[in-house]
């Protein structure tokens, strides 16, 4: 059930996944929605007692989809929009006054105003958010300075009150970046730059979508199921470099490489993976096993089960079971299978719940 | 492969599950062995640079069963004995000189010596470990005081150097307790006392074994698969009370209750669950899917796969597949299934790897 309202002075007890920092409860709710496992959250507002906890956004999960509510001054709690039918966007154009969002300050320069600073951030490959010191800032040498910032998670490592500064986020997710959008996928190619993370994926398109929605992934390399080393098959390496482009291209069969689509305006979904993968089993943490008629019904079942992230449908019992096969509903810590097996006859795929999280934009 | 040796001045990088405190590396290795997921560990000895990290035992896991080794003064690393064939015991009779093992001090009294203090701990239902101030202790009013201690995990919350004290563990796991050993399982009974934890189990016997090896479980209630509320079926509630006995017995059909066997001398295994559960599917995190001939072969496969904790064997494809069925190897955070389904035709069970962790004792 979709619960949009926020609960003031209420803390959800237990179920903690991780803590991030957000400028307000509304943004915390969006972060929770995009997190692969978060179903509920508690945000600690400035009115809360412990100032070291201000702006902390505690992401939570629960098998029962609910947690005990405890009274706590300054806590604001709510549910993710995963349970809701409406279209979503990670785009956040808000400017936060008197807040310093903390991260790695990797670029500082003078800009006319906060809007220009935000544009700089949007057009810099590494920038997640910025802080701008206004012309009223006490220290004269810092006035009009635009600090571009990034972190390993894409979210601030902390947020503090600071007079006469404003902060905001990159508008890449609003499809407002002027950076190059490279849609090509390069066969027989390995990019040998820095790996940020690795996930398991059924094909290069899914690998690209995962890269697109990873805060620091600029390009990727995917090892196909035919890759000679078994341990690397279906492995998607998420990559970055200082320049923002791959420094090293190596020719290797059965590998494919490409770029994040974070700078693109999309006519196709880049968040949800709607294809079916035949003769493919996705392994993960099992949520439930149910009998359904066909793999489409299995995908529907997964989409309607709020904690389900992907599924495998096995038709081996169809003949004995009134045309029904077995639908395995699954999840993992990052939303991707922990392993992919081929040749076992399963049909696998992902929840379509994420489709509503795509930006609705025109092609760039 | 079984690696018994410890690596001095080596730190295993990454893979952290949790940190506990142990008096030495040898005890850390035993804790790792009994932890459901730990395969490797790093112990920080007194020779390490950061004194706040002394005696910390960092339990680690790795999909590849290994982690990068990094040079670090005072770190001692090694592997769990899960990979080893020899019989094991959690019994630890060692006395640690000049160490204060920290926990909740819930009982302090005068004893003649450390041995008598250890006996008191062994014969107190709640005691996990003790610290004894010797007759040379600087503060006269604390001399010969025996502090009985417990913690939520059964392990110290910290360990510090303290002159003229000695510390040690309860010898309940050495089968040396004089506390009552109640083997009865009470049908149609719910104990409504404090819940420490809840796990999923296929029957009351497995629930009892889990209770027996939980540091704080004194008794349990198990809801059978016939329990009217679906959400509670196969739920094993691990319980405690201040007195050590249930305060509240409520008559309810389809529930069974009983006591931890931690005070018993066992003629039967109480750690490993060797039965097969027919027409039963255990759900969990999937490790692998393999084709094998029969459920015994599946159990063997699980036992030999070091990270496998339980399995489900499905014979539905036997007819098409040269008499082979599908063996699903699984794990979870606590070693128990996350859910149990009935009526789907699977045959499920647990790894036999834990059988070597049982005390070999005579019947009491």
């Amino acid at each position: 059930e979709c619960v949009i309202k926020l609960f003031s002075d209420i803390y959800f007890q237990g179920g903690d996944i991780t803590t991030v920092y957000t400028p307000n409860a509304k943004h915390c709710q969006v972060v929770c929605t995009y997190h692969p496992r978060c179903l509920l959250f508690t945000f600690m507002a400035e009115s809360s007692v412990d100032s070291t906890k201000w702006f902390s956004c505690i992401l939570k999960d629960s098998v029962t989809e609910s947690l005990p509510k405890v009274n706590m001054t300054g806590a604001i709690s709510g549910y993710s929009f995963k349970q809701c039918p409406h279209q979503l966007s990670a785009c956040n154009k808000d400017i936060y006054v008197d807040l310093d969002m903390q991260g790695m300050n990797y670029n500082g320069s003078v800009t006319k105003n906060a809007q220009e600073c935000q544009e700089r951030c949007t057009n810099d490959a590494h920038c997640h958010f910025f802080t701008y010191a206004t012309r009223q800032f006490p220290s004269a040498e810092h006035r009009n300075i635009c600090l571009l910032k990034y972190t390993q998670t894409g979210a601030p490592t902390g947020i503090r009150k600071l007079k006469k500064v404003v902060s905001g986020f990159s508008l890449k997710s609003c499809a407002l970046s002027n950076l190059a959008c490279i849609r090509d996928i390069f066969p027989s190619t390995v990019f040998a730059d820095n790996n940020i993370d690795s996930v398991v994926a059924p094909d290069a398109l899914v690998c690209r979508r995962i890269c697109t929605h990873h805060p620091n992934c600029l390009f990727f390399t995917f090892f196909s199921q035919e890759w000679p080393k078994e341990s690397h098959r279906n492995l998607c390496l998420l990559k970055t470099s200082e320049s923002g482009l791959p420094s090293t291209r190596i020719h290797k069969n059965q590998a494919l490489s490409g770029f994040s689509l974070q700078n693109c305006r999309h006519s196709i979904p880049v968040f949800c993976h709607s294809s079916f993968y035949y003769d493919t089993d996705f392994l993960g943490e099992e949520l439930d096993i149910v009998d359904v008629k066909g793999h489409e019904a299995c995908q529907k079942m997964c989409t309607s089960a709020i904690r389900c992230q992907f599924f495998t449908y096995s038709s081996s019992q169809e003949s004995h079971n009134k045309g029904k096969g077995t639908c395995y509903l699954k999840l993992s810590s990052n939303g991707s299978p922990t392993k992919i097996l081929h040749g076992r006859g399963g049909i696998s795929g992902y929840t379509l719940r994420l489709c509503k999280m795509d930006n609705v934009c025109t092609t760039k | 492969e079984c690696v018994i040796k410890l690596f001095s001045d080596i730190y295993f990088q990454g893979g952290d599950i949790t940190t506990v405190y142990t008096p030495n590396a040898k005890h850390c290795q035993v804790v790792c062995t009994y932890h459901p997921r730990c395969l490797l560990f790093t112990f920080m000895a007194e020779s390490s640079v950061d004194s706040t990290k002394w005696f910390s035992c960092i339990l680690k896991d790795s999909v590849t069963e290994s982690l990068p080794k990094v040079n670090m003064t005072g770190a001692i690393s090694g592997y769990s004995f899960k990979q080893c064939p020899h019989q094991l015991s959690a019994c630890n009779k060692d006395i640690y000189v000049d160490l204060d093992m920290q926990g909740m001090n819930y009982n302090g009294s005068v004893t003649k010596n450390a041995q008598e203090c250890q006996e008191r701990c062994t014969n107190d239902a709640h005691c996990h470990f003790f610290t004894y101030a010797t007759r040379q202790f600087p503060s006269a009013e604390h001399r010969n005081i025996c502090l009985l201690k417990y913690t939520q995990t059964g392990a110290p919350t910290g360990i510090r150097k303290l002159k003229k004290v000695v510390s040690g563990f309860s010898l309940k796991s050495c089968a040396l307790s004089n506390l009552a050993c109640i083997r009865d399982i009470f049908p149609s009974t719910v104990f409504a006392d404090n819940n420490i934890d809840s796990v999923v189990a296929p029957d009351a016997l497995v629930c009892r074994r889990i209770c027996t090896h939980h540091p704080n479980c004194l008794f349990f209630t198990f809801f059978s698969q016939e329990w009217p509320k679906e959400s509670h079926r196969n739920l094993c509630l691990l319980k405690t009370s201040e007195s050590g006995l249930p305060s509240t017995r409520i008559h309810k059909n389809q529930a069974l209750s009983g006591f931890s066997l931690q005070n018993c001398r066992h003629s039967i295994p109480v750690f490993c669950h060797s039965s097969f559960y027919y027409d039963t599917d255990f759900l969990g995190e999937e490790l692998d899917i393999v084709d094998v001939k029969g459920h015994e072969a599946c159990q063997k496969m699980c036992t030999s796969a070091i990270r496998c904790q339980f399995f489900t064997y499905s014979s539905s494809q036997e007819s098409h597949n040269k008499g082979k069925g599908t063996c699903y190897l699984k794990l979870s955070s606590n070693g128990s299934p996350t859910k149990i389904l009935h009526g789907r035709g699977g045959i499920s069970g647990y790894t036999l790897r834990l059988c070597k962790m049982d005390n070999v004792c005579t019947t009491k």
């Epitope: 007890q13 237990g14 098998v63 029962t64 005990p68 405890v70 | 939520q152 719910v190 104990f191 409504a192 006392d193 404090n194 819940n195 420490i196 809840s198 209630t221 009217p228 509320k229 679906e230 959400s231 509670h232 739920l235 509630l237 319980k239 409520i250 008559h251 309810k252 059909n253």
Partner: nanobody, 126 residues
Framework: QVQLVESGGGSVQAGGSLRLSCTAS????????MAWYRQAPGNECELVST???????YYADSVKGRFTISQDNSKNTMYLQMNSLRAEDTAVYYC????????????????????WGQGTLVTVSS
């Protein structure tokens, strides 16, 4: 979203009476085991009384003969009639559904399928 809402708490003199109510939404009483728990400041959560789905009742020794548990399935409401109240009955009283024992001595932690209300304060002055 299952919700249990308690009402009827308040202040009363020793020897007085109060009637607590617990109303459930998104939840039916007839196949549930309902209970009242209480937690006094600094104390652990304790079971006061239970009414099982088959109509069986249980009372803690400290309240036997003074408290009566009942439920009205048509109103999806459970009651606790508290007579001859004593100072030691002062606590926050929690309504619980399918909750066999509290967790870590706290009247809010649940295992899957168990539910708690948010509590209502009862103060008895001597």
């Amino acid at each position: 979203q299952v919700q249990l809402v308690e009402s009827g708490g308040g202040s009363v003199q020793a020897g007085g009476s109060l009637r607590l109510s617990c109303t459930a939404s998104e939840f039916t009483f007839d196949d549930s085991d309902m209970a009242w728990y209480r937690q006094a400041p600094g104390n652990e959560c304790e079971l006061v009384s239970t009414i099982t789905s088959d109509g069986g009742t249980y009372y803690a020794d400290s309240v036997k003969g003074r408290f009566t548990i009942s439920q009205d399935n048509s109103k999806n409401t459970m009651y606790l009639q508290m007579n001859s109240l004593r100072a030691e009955d002062t606590a926050v009283y929690y309504c619980a559904a399918d909750q066999w024992g509290s967790a870590e001595g706290d009247c809010t932690s649940s295992y899957p399928g168990g539910y708690w209300g948010q509590g209502t304060l009862v103060t008895v002055s001597s």
